[in-house]
Amino acid sequence: QQQTLPKPFIWAEPHFMVPKEKQVTICCQGNYGAVEYQLHFEGSLFAVDRPKPPERINKVKFYIPDMNSRMAGQYSCIYRVGELWSEPSNLLDLVVTEMYDTPTLSVHPGPEVISGEKVTFYCRLDTATSMFLLLKEGRSSHVQRGYGKVQAEFPLGPVTTAHRGTYRCFGSYNNHAWSFPSEPVKLLVTGDIENTSLAPEDPTFPADTWGTYLLTTETGLQKDHALWDHTAQNLLR
């Protein structure tokens, strides 16, 4: 006999990276008929929701109106149908960004590179941090971690046209508190000598999304957030 229900799916809307003082919604999707959802933060009960009518609702939302470092951390949720509880969801790492300072990002040999060359991103932040994160915008969001006193190197390559895209870096004060994002660096990769055409870029967020990623949920972020979250959060762990 089944002792637990399938685990629910947890995510953050519009994004798991939340600028401080902005709002975020944590969503938990379980099953129709669930009478209670519990949101846990860092292992302790954080919030409860009892959907009405339960048979018509399979998802609840927990609203955080004002993000700060105390709200950043690992969230999970569970739900109950009758007396039977579900398995806990995967962990959601909620990150507060725009803390303290803005790093600078440079790329070597430059923003326009040739397929086959090796590329190094350098991220620098003078305030006290030792961990840096390099993020590539887009559907197949790549996140790299680097370490250094004030600067970290992120080697890439040999590059292909798949490396094309917009990169930003963050300084990380801990796993869940990140700096402001750096200015973007757009990496262009031309083909080899025989084929100098540029391949299509990875599907990316609309151009204005990054700066307003907490102000709208109508930019296509909703469709991509699960992929982004999964990649980035595996890295966080």
Epitope: P109, E117, P155
Partner: antibody, heavy 115, light 107 residues
Framework: QVQLQQPGSVLVRPGASVKLSCKAS????????MHWAKQRPGQGLEWIGH????????NYNEKFKGKATLTVDTSSSTAYVDLSSLTSEDSAVYYC????????WGAGTTVTVSS | DIQMTQSPSSLSASLGERVSLTCRAS??????LNWLQQEPDGTIKRLIY???RLDSGVPKRFSGSRSGSDYSLTISSLESEDFVDYYC?????????FGGGTKLEIK
């Protein structure tokens, strides 16, 4: 066209420091890396480090950490390498080179360390 | 650090001859390799970048190629001004490193 102007030569005393300059023109100074390299008489080239004038990000060959400090003055489009505690081993030609792929090279400055 | 082993260290050849210089990389550097030419007065000029791309203004007799971890500079028909020093340089992984150089002498 791109020009990287370096002083021809400089004579310094052992134990002293020297600041070598590389004045750039013909391109946007803040958009390209600036590298420095050393060549001892009759020897090959060694990379000292590089700096990005826009971000101030610099990176050094471990061998030259504590010996060389790279800086830039964006207002005059000039890059500098500061060499400290000079010994006869530091007598060499020092080159600046523009761009991540070392696109263009200065003519080099000959540093002679002698009492 | 990546070692760049350049060979030969010196080479005697005749005008009109075809010669090849080689650099072997100790680690993968992709196509991040330059060939530089140094005149007797110390002037350095880049000839080839990204393994095989010819710089503008460089004569077509110069060409670059790669076979695995071996990178070659070929001069198809030597002219008098080619008898100078040549260096390879990898810019794949910091610290960027140079080959030991090849002195090309006239026979």
């Amino acid at each position: 066209q791109v020009q990287l102007q370096q002083p021809g030569s400089v004579l310094v005393r052992p134990g002293a420091s020297v600041k070598l300059s590389c004045k750039a023109s013909g391109y946007t100074f803040t958009s390209s890396w600036m590298h420095w390299a050393k060549q001892r008489p009759g020897q090959g080239l060694e990379w000292i480090g590089h700096i990005h004038p826009n971000s101030g990000i610099s990176n050094y060959n471990e061998k030259f950490k504590g010996k060389a400090t790279l800086t830039v003055d964006t207002s005059s489009s000039t890059a500098y390498v500061d060499l400290s505690s000079l010994t006869s081993e530091d007598s060499a030609v020092y080159y600046c080179s523009r761009g991540g792929r070392f696109d263009d090279w200065g003519a080099g400055t000959t540093v002679t360390v002698s009492s | 650090d990546i070692q760049m082993t350049q060979s030969p260290s010196s080479l005697s050849a005749s005008l009109g001859e075809r010669v090849s210089l080689t650099c072997r990389a100790s680690q993968d550097i992709g196509s991040s390799l330059n060939w530089l030419q140094q005149e007797p007065d110390g002037t350095i000029k880049r000839l080839i970048y990204a393994t095989s791309r010819l710089d503008s203004g460089v004569p077509k007799r110069f060409s670059g190629s790669r076979s695995g971890s071996d990178y070659s500079l070929t001069i198809s028909s030597l002219e008098s001004e080619d008898f100078v020093d040549y260096y390879c340089l990898q810019y794949a992984s910091s610290p960027w490193t140079f080959g030991g150089g090849t002195k090309l002498e006239i026979k």
